[in-house]
Amino acid sequence: PRSIEVKYIGVKSAYVSYDAEKRTIYLNITNTLNITNNNYYSVEVENITAQVQFSKTVIGKARLNNITNIGPLDMKQIDYTVPTVIAEEMSYMYDFCTLLSIKVHNIVLMMQVTVTTAYFGHSEQISQERYQYVDCGRNTTYQLAQSEYLNVLQPQQ
């Protein structure tokens, strides 16, 4: 079999909300993946599991099941959303993200994603990791996942 390629494109949108009483930040992060099937037969994307880390702590997880079928020599772009919560021992971040004196509140998050594909009863997992900047002070949307350029570090295969 030929390869199935997974390319993490980047953050498509990040929507933020806050709970001042709980000193908690809620970040809904939508990411974009390109999955390319280099085979001459269809491949099933069984599931996508994703997690987001801040400062080595997992702040959000998501799983998508029975996602799509990718035809021979075809590529599909898939968006997935990870709801994240920055709270408790990281509640000090609430002060930073709502700091009145600055307009830009960048934090670095690690996006981890694993794609499970299946063909002819055979399963394969492909993982990617990418560090991304997110502004935790405002909502951000990107045109056509332009955030491909946001890499802090190159992906670790």
């Epitope: 806050y18 001042a20 709502t98 009145l100 004196s101 307009k103 830009v104 946001l150």
Partner: antibody, heavy 118, light 113 residues
Framework: EVQLQQSGPVLVKPGPSVKISCMAS????????IHWVKQSHGKSLEWIGL????????NYNQNFKGKATLTVDTSSRTAYMELNSLTSEDSAVYYC???????????WGQGTLVTVSE | DIVMTQSPSSLSVSVGEKVTVSCKSS????????????LAWYQQKPGQPPKLLIY???TRESGVPDRFTGSGSGTDFTLTISSVQAEDLAVYYC?????????FGAGTKLELK
């Protein structure tokens, strides 16, 4: 519909001070920054500063420090701006506006005309 | 403070015409972290408060017609109205949304020919 209801026009003599108000309705007052913006007649917009109702925190434009004082009364969901040492230069329309934290200013009050004249 | 320079200061247009308004900032409005430009465009009609049209340099506010397009990066930005309608006659302001104090351009007045 979201509303920021500002107090009516005021005519004041040069000298002391004037306090104008901005009452919020339909949205969670504590969840937004309230900004104040000055627009002199036929001129552009000047950002005066903002106040965070939740804790009363403020951020002023240096050009208005000492001129404007921003406060809030959360019980009445009202933001106030006091302008002191009034001169004719302070004659303008003053807008209150809101932003969801550091997001852009998305909604504005109708404006309060302040006229400083003998 | 970031200085915002708009041009032209006024523009005489006919309905259906394409219009471009330029805005230059004295410092970059690019958030080098997330690669987003923090610039907003407002429309102000006589006797009314400003209305947010575009933020993040290119994202249209909800309900804004798609004839309004924002573009540009760093220090050079453009607001384009693809086909001007009578209701578009107003003053347009660009605004630095990158750092305090927030600063506005002097405005571009759109008038009917």
């Amino acid at each position: 519909e979201v509303q920021l209801q500002q107090s009516g026009p005021v005519l004041v003599k040069p000298g002391p001070s004037v306090k104008i108000s901005c009452m919020a309705s339909v949205f969670t007052f504590n969840d937004y920054y309230i900004h104040w913006v000055k627009q002199s007649h036929g001129k552009s917009l000047e950002w005066i500063g903002l106040v965070y109702p939740y804790n009363g925190g403020t951020n002023y434009n240096q050009n208005f420090k000492g001129k404007a004082t921003l406060t809030v009364d959360t019980s009445s969901r009202t933001a106030y701006m006091e302008l002191n040492s009034l001169t004719s230069e302070d004659s303008a329309v003053y807008y209150c506006a809101r932003s969801y934290f550091s997001n852009p200013i998305g909604y504005w009050g109708q404006g309060t005309l302040v006229t400083v004249s003998e | 403070d970031i200085v915002m320079t708009q041009s032209p200061s006024s523009l005489s247009v006919s309905v259906g015409e394409k219009v471009t308004v330029s805005c230059k900032s004295s410092q970059s409005l690019l958030n080098s972290g997330n690669q987003k430009n923090y610039l907003a465009w407002y429309q102000q009609k006589p006797g009314q408060p400003p209305k947010l049209l575009i933020y993040g340099a290119s994202t249209r506010e909800s309900g804004v017609p798609d004839r309004f397009t924002g573009s540009g990066s760093g220090t050079d930005f453009t607001l384009t109205i693809s086909s001007v309608q009578a209701e578009d006659l107003a003053v347009y302001y660009c605004q630095n949304d990158h750092s305090y104090p927030l600063t506005f351009g002097a405005g571009t007045k759109l008038e009917l020919k």
